[in-house]
């Protein structure tokens, strides 16, 4: 995936609800720093739905690819109001950006 293209997608579609930087504040959605390798519903200090907490998967490229295509299908009961990204290449770009930005 292309990190720069992914950053644009993040700004357009995700940044209104999420921050990515270390120590970034929770908004409508949780801060995403340290996302990769973390289980669902475990960002410290954010109140998740039971659906999110109970999903029990680890965030990595494959799980994010599936989730970002259709969040409500992947985690029924999630409070994330986002229809998803149908284009595979766009999801790959967004994931590349998330991988970089959430670990710096």
């Amino acid at each position: 995936g292309d990190v720069e293209k992914g950053k644009k997608i993040f700004v357009q579609k995700c940044a209104q609800c999420h921050t990515v930087e270390k120590g970034g504040k929770h908004k409508t959605g949780p801060n995403l720093h340290g996302l990769f390798g973390r289980k669902t519903g475990q960002a410290p200090g954010f109140t998740y739905t039971d659906a999110n907490k109970n999903k029990g998967i680890t965030w990595k490229e494959e799980t994010l690819m599936e989730y970002l295509e259709n969040p409500k299908k992947y985690i029924p009961g999630t409070k994330m109001i986002f229809a998803g990204i149908k284009k595979k290449t766009e999801r790959e770009d967004l994931i590349a950006y998330l991988k970089k930005a959430t670990n710096e």
Partner: antibody, heavy 117, light 107 residues
């Protein structure tokens, strides 16, 4: 207790193929990546590749692309490494490991493969 | 593909000394770096992940640092049980290559 149990030592002839197994207990392999790592005698670690058992998605180091095939059977919680067209260069200890990006990191005890006529 | 260059290849140090092992990536790996310890005849064990986070049960004399392309593992007050080989591995993009290793011998 989390454990990765690898199959026993193998002695095989040049040109043959072999399939090594790695059975997990104490965790579900669908929850992480399963990797295979090669270590030749007195040498360093070489990453062969990984599988995401939940999706079947595999990634390989290009230098092992034509040599190795990684598969997983989620029903038996087992990962496999098949090595083909064996030569003396394939003589090594092969480790399976379960890890992704975090603190979860478990390794098998290693399987010794000897290729000799 | 990202290549990992680890140095030194070997070193000898006394109990109580501080040693530092470095790993240089051929591209930015954005802190996706782990350090492993391996004793002869044993499987590798995770020491550090995400460049600086200590794995569960790892003594605090071990510490990881770095960013971008340059990373290091520091062992303070070396103990006899710290002998063995140390490897870095990056997790940024596949292949997730290892460094060449550092053999640490206790004087």
């Amino acid at each position: 207790e989390v454990q990765l149990q690898q199959s026993g030592a193998e002695l095989v002839k040049p040109g043959a193929s072999v399939k090594l197994s790695c059975t997990a207990s104490g965790f579900n392999i669908k929850d992480t990546y399963m990797h295979w790592v090669k270590q030749r005698p007195e040498k360093g670690l070489e990453w062969i590749g990984r599988i995401d058992p939940a999706s079947g998605n595999t990634k390989y180091d290009p230098k092992f692309q034509d040599k190795a095939t990684i598969t997983a059977d989620t029903s038996s919680n087992t990962a496999y490494l098949q090595l083909s067209s064996l030569t003396s260069e394939d003589t090594a200890v092969y480790y399976c490991a379960g890890y992704d990006y975090g603190n979860f990191d478990y390794w098998g005890q290693g399987t010794t493969l000897t290729v000799s006529s | 593909d990202i290549q990992m260059t680890q140095s030194p290849a070997s070193l000898s140090a006394s109990v109580g000394e501080t040693v530092t092992i470095t790993c240089r990536a051929s591209g930015n790996i954005h802190n996706y770096l782990a350090w492993y310890q391996q004793k002869p005849g044993k499987s590798p064990q995770l020491l550090v992940y995400n460049a600086k986070t200590l794995a569960d049960g790892v003594p605090s004399r071990f510490s990881g640092s770095g960013s971008g392309t340059q990373y290091s593992l520091k062992i303070n007050s070396l103990q006899p049980e710290d002998f063995g080989s140390y490897y870095c591995q990056h997790f940024w993009s596949t292949p997730w290559t290892f460094g060449g290793g550092t053999k640490l011998e206790i004087k």
